[in-house]
Amino acid sequence: VPRWRQQWSGPGTTKRFPETVLARCVKYTEIHPEMRHVDCQSVWDAFKGAFISKHPCNITEEDYQPLMKLGTQTVPCNKILLWSRIKDLAHQFTQVQRDMFTLEDTLLGYLADDLTWCGEFNTSKINYQSCPDWRKDCSNNPVSVFWKTVSRRFAEAACDVVHVMLNGSRSKIFDKNSTFGSVEVHNLQPEKVQTLEAWVIHGGREDSRDLCQDPTIKELESIISKRNIQFSCKNIYRPDKFLQCVKNPEDSSCTSEI
């Protein structure tokens, strides 16, 4: 008789999840010499230990603490780039501007990027059929708690000028319910962070509006100012040109507004 299995509303664990995490860890430690001491088997064991045999709606930050310890890493606190709803461009940027870091440029962020995972209470099985959806099922699920934990710690580590890339094509350019709006904004440390600088990325070729005047950006400014952190905002009208100018800042066309 097949054992009854909880059906959740979200997609199941990414196929070949253990192999993917282990392979990513190995690749990361090969690319980043300062992390070559990391024991990827121990990293996988700690990752697995955070959710295996636990009810996937009852995961805590504490469950991920062993993994956090193994992911200890130097991140220049004044070179942090946050993003919301525009991950690909943020990653393209840090691939060019190698001294800046998104969360996914760290070992822990790299391991989990775009993956889904969950287990089942009292069994050592990984659930490949379905996992809890944040809205429809529960917020304390393995994936959501992981990203809340590492996002909070990443924001806490930031100092001086922190940059955030925002998607100007969205109806809510700043969304209070995003990870940036609900976690990172509130965990920037006012004693360490002087300024949050928002880069609003335009989508349309002919879009010349000043999206820094958008009501949601004004809302972000208000939240940040109340936390005694200065706020500044820049329009990036041409993201393609922006990236090109990061690659080749001496280009004569890069002196004009981008």
């Epitope: 200890t72 130097t74 004693e191």
Partner: nanobody
């Protein structure tokens, strides 16, 4: 601006003890969790221990549990690490850093601990 100054390192024989200190400035010390991390020669950064802002909660790497004790004196804005039963593998530069990790940007020069017979 967060600034820290570590001291107390030195050469010690296996089984010996040292007490590291870290004087902090530029921020409200008691508001922040503080950590010790270390870097052995030719190795990466390893987290050692963390203490909460009030000093009420502490956490240790398995490799130092039972041998090292982290503490703080908020009135002196100073963090400490008492290291007992030192081993050769504890040889490293020790840094103190604000926060609980896993992401650290240590601001001090660190203090070198060498355990050798």
């Amino acid at each position: 601006e967060v600034q820290v100054l570590e001291s107390g390192g030195g050469l010690v024989q296996p089984g010996g003890s040292l007490r590291l200190s870290c004087e902090a400035s530029g921020f409200t010390f008691s508001n922040f969790a503080m950590s010790w991390v270390r870097q052995a020669p030719g190795k990466g950064l390893e987290w050692v221990s963390t203490i909460s802002g009030s000093g009420g909660t502490t956490d240790y790497a398995d490799s130092v549990k039972g041998r090292f004790t982290i503490s703080r004196d908020n009135s002196k804005k100073t963090l400490y690490l008492q290291m007992n039963s030192l081993r050769v593998e504890d040889t490293a530069v020790y840094y103190c850093a604000d926060g609980r990790g896993p992401f650290f940007d240590y601001r001090g020069q660190g203090t070198l601990v060498t355990v050798s017979s």
